[in-house]
């Protein structure tokens, strides 16, 4: 270790024999008192009570007696003043100070940087008596020094109330560098320059920095800590790291890996999680982002129907939560989806395509052309249509729902019939006379029922009557048609 | 604006030595490496080696070890390279050039001829 | 050593054609500056670091590859252009430069 002597000055008279150096070895001490709590009480009983002491650093005792002659003023003697030790050495230093007999109690505590040492510190004080005075020495020892330790220590003690403050110790721990800036991975953009930075401290200080891109040393002359390194910019993923050199030695940052951001992978695992007949859901998995958080994503759905004309719908979602529902399908049919997701950097590549279905649905289309006529001599309705049109059936036709309204006089009533798919006609009876007959008609596939068509009124008149002309679903723009004779 | 200045052209003996000073200005002189490089007669570039100029520390390569030495002056911002036992196939322009991260050469000095003739 | 092997030696063009030298590499390297020297002249630093151009130099200079090929582009070249170019590696000590390429006007 490498110390710094101050010189010694007396501000005492101390008792014969060196002091405190190599102590004598007839000077055994009376009482070696080691610290528990860091807060060390040093006893001393005297029959004389002392007068108040002088405040501050240096105690001037005041005695009463005959003569009343004062003593000189009480100050811890000087000592090493800076010790300078390497990481994990031992360190011993002590405060040392001769006090009257005539004082009763003294306390000596150990103070680091303006606060007290309590705890586990290995700390003892020893006492050393004479006619006069008593010498006490407070040591202090660290077995393994760490950065922690570096810092000024002082001795304080209390004396009737009064306080003696020793000059500081400093300790100064040196060792390898350390670091207190390392450089950290990143995902940069090809060809595009970016910053690494480092930092390390000693002590010893200056704390130079070396770079070091895959293994090849970047600057050969170091740059003094901190030090800021522009990457001219990657092709391809490198591993950084820095190396802190200080008198002591070399220090070696972690290594970080620097990665190229990339367009994506395709998702992969595209899968149909439901269909209906004008909806499919799909969900996915995500390829490799590319270090590079993905953005959106894009569907891409084509009909797998050879006769098809080929055209691609392409819906955008966001690219949370791997799910899309596929909507404005035709039912019934048959379509390849293909999922692309992009990050700041572009698009990837389109996934496996995939086949899927739309179910039967519900028509689209009500059956058209639907006409009504009294046949009176039988006492029905005949009613006539034309099927909807097969793109638009959303399924195979199984019947057609039939709904008739009879109002008459504050009466109404509707009736339902079930017709098969086969027929474009049906007979009704006639409910009700002097009457009006309300008919609409509606496709029905496995999928559902379809919107009824445009209502068609036909009136019934009293028995007895003509037959009538048949009434018909109206051309566009005439409403609630009726036929009355 | 960054310079390195050279001496001049030097025509020396076999067997004699050469001093070339290399003055740079408008930057921090031990900041920056500096690096020697060869120029043969209608050759190309070949690079001598560096000094580090905060340590004062020499490098060389493999074919410049021996009776090549780099030099500094830091307090007039000053390389120096000096050759001894010239033999004729020392001849050649010799650069000085500043020498940064990443081993770029990016400021040049302005050459100097050693020309080694009996 | 890594050796740098530039192609064509040689090249001889005409004012506004694109020109492309190549620079390959006996083993891979980190990057590859490129240095112009006219003649009688020092070399001067062109592209540092693979692709990125150096202070005051024209945007019609361009370099790219990574690896052990790396190539140096005049995208239209202009009179002062005719010189002759330099490949040097960074990756493993010591540095070296490649044989050099002349372009000559055609």
């Known amino acids: 270790a490498i110390t710094e002597a101050r010189e010694e000055a007396k501000p005492y008279p101390l008792f014969p024999g060196p002091f405190p150096g190599s102590l004598q070895t007839d000077h055994t001490p009376l009482l070696s008192l080691p610290h528990a709590s860091g807060y060390q009480p040093a006893l001393m009983f005297s029959p004389t009570q002392p007068g108040r002491p002088h405040t501050g650093n240096v105690a001037i005792p005041q005695v009463t007696s005959v003569e009343s002659k004062p003593l000189p003023p009480l100050a811890f003697k000087h000592t090493v003043g800076h010790i300078i030790l390497s990481e994990h050495k031992g360190v011993k230093f002590n405060c040392s100070i001769s006090v009257p007999n005539i004082y009763q109690d003294t306390t000596i505590s150990w103070w680091k940087d303006g606060k007290e040492l309590l705890g586990a510190h290995h700390a003892i004080t020893q006492f050393y008596p004479d006619d006069e005075v008593t010498a006490i020495i407070a040591s202090f020892s660290i077995t393994s020094v760490q950065r922690s330790d570096n810092g000024s220590y002082i001795c304080k003690m209390k004396i009737n109330n009064e306080e003696i403050v020793s000059d500081p110790i400093y300790i100064e721990v040196q060792g390898l560098p350390h670091f207190t800036k390392q450089p950290e991975s990143m995902n940069v953009t090809r060809n595009t320059a970016f910053n690494l930075t480092c930092q390390a401290v000693g002590p010893p200080e200056p704390v130079n920095i070396f770079w070091v891109q895959n293994s090849s040393r970047v600057n050969e002359q170091p740059e003094k800590s901190p030090s800021v390194l522009t990457v001219p910019g990657l092709t391809e993923m490198a591993v950084f790291s820095c190396e802190a050199h200080n008198d002591k030695g070399l220090t070696v940052s972690k290594g970080v890996q620097i990665n190229i951001k990339a367009i994506p992978s395709p998702p992969t695992e595209v899968s149909i999680r439901n269909s209906t007949a004008h909806s499919i859901l799909i969900s996915w998995v995500p390829g490799f982002d590319g270090y590079s958080p993905f953005r959106n994503c894009s569907i891409q759905v084509k009909e797998a129907d050879p006769l098809s004309n080929g055209s691609v719908m392409i819906f955008n979602t966001s690219a949370l939560p791997h799910l899309y529902q596929i909507k404005q399908l035709q039912a019934l049919a048959n379509y390849s989806i293909g999922v692309s997701c992009m990050n700041e950097i572009g698009w990837s590549a389109v996934s496996p395509w995939i086949l899927a279905s739309t179910t039967e649905g519900a028509p689209s289309v009500a059956p058209l052309n639907v006409t009504v006529f009294l046949n009176e001599s039988s006492d029905n309705v005949d009613i006539r249509w034309m099927k909807p049109p097969t793109k638009q059936q959303d399924g195979e036709l199984v019947g057609y729902r039939i709904s008739h309204v009879w109002q008459s006089a504050g009466i109404s009533k509707e009736l339902l019939e079930e017709v098969g798919q086969n027929g474009s006609r049906a007979r009704i009876s006639v409910q009700v006379h002097n009457a009006t007959c309300t008919v609409r008609i509606a496709a029905v596939t496995r999928g559902g029922v379809g919107p009824f068509s445009d209502p068609v009124k036909i009136f019934i008149p009293a028995h007895g009557w003509v037959d009538y002309a048949p009434s018909s679903t109206p051309a566009p723009g005439n409403a609630d048609p009726v036929l009355i004779i | 604006q960054v310079q390195l200045v050279q001496s001049g052209s030097e025509l020396k003996k076999p067997g004699a030595s050469v001093k070339v000073s290399c003055k740079a200005s408008?930057?921090?002189?031990?900041?920056?490496?500096m690096s020697w490089v060869r120029q043969a007669p209608g050759q190309g570039l070949e690079w001598m080696g560096w000094i580090n100029t905060a340590s004062g520390v020499p490098t060389y390569t493999d074919d410049f070890k021996g009776r090549f030495v780099f030099s500094l002056d830091t307090s007039v911002s000053t390389a120096y390279l000096q050759i001894s036992s010239l033999k004729a196939e020392d001849t050649a322009v010799y650069y000085c050039?500043?020498?940064?991260?990443?081993?770029?050469?990016?400021?040049w000095g302005q050459g100097t001829l050693v020309t080694v003739s009996s | 050593d890594i050796q740098l092997t530039q192609s064509p030696s040689f090249l001889s063009a005409s004012v506004g054609d694109r020109v492309t030298i190549t620079c390959r590499a006996s083993?891979?390297?980190?990057?590859m500056h490129w240095y112009q020297q006219e003649p009688g002249k020092a070399p001067k630093l062109l592209i540092y670091a693979t692709s990125n151009l150096a202070q005051g130099v024209p945007s019609r200079f361009s370099g790219s590859g990574s690896g052990t090929e790396f190539t140096l582009t005049i995208s239209s070249l202009q009179p002062e252009d005719f010189a002759t170019y330099y490949c040097q590696q960074w990756g493993s000590l010591p540095f070296t430069f490649g044989q050099g390429t002349k372009l000559e006007i055609k």
């Open positions: 408008s930057y921090t002189f031990t900041t920056y490496g």
């Open positions: 083993s891979s390297v980190g990057y």
């Open positions: 050039a500043r020498y940064t991260n990443y081993g770029v050469f990016d400021y």
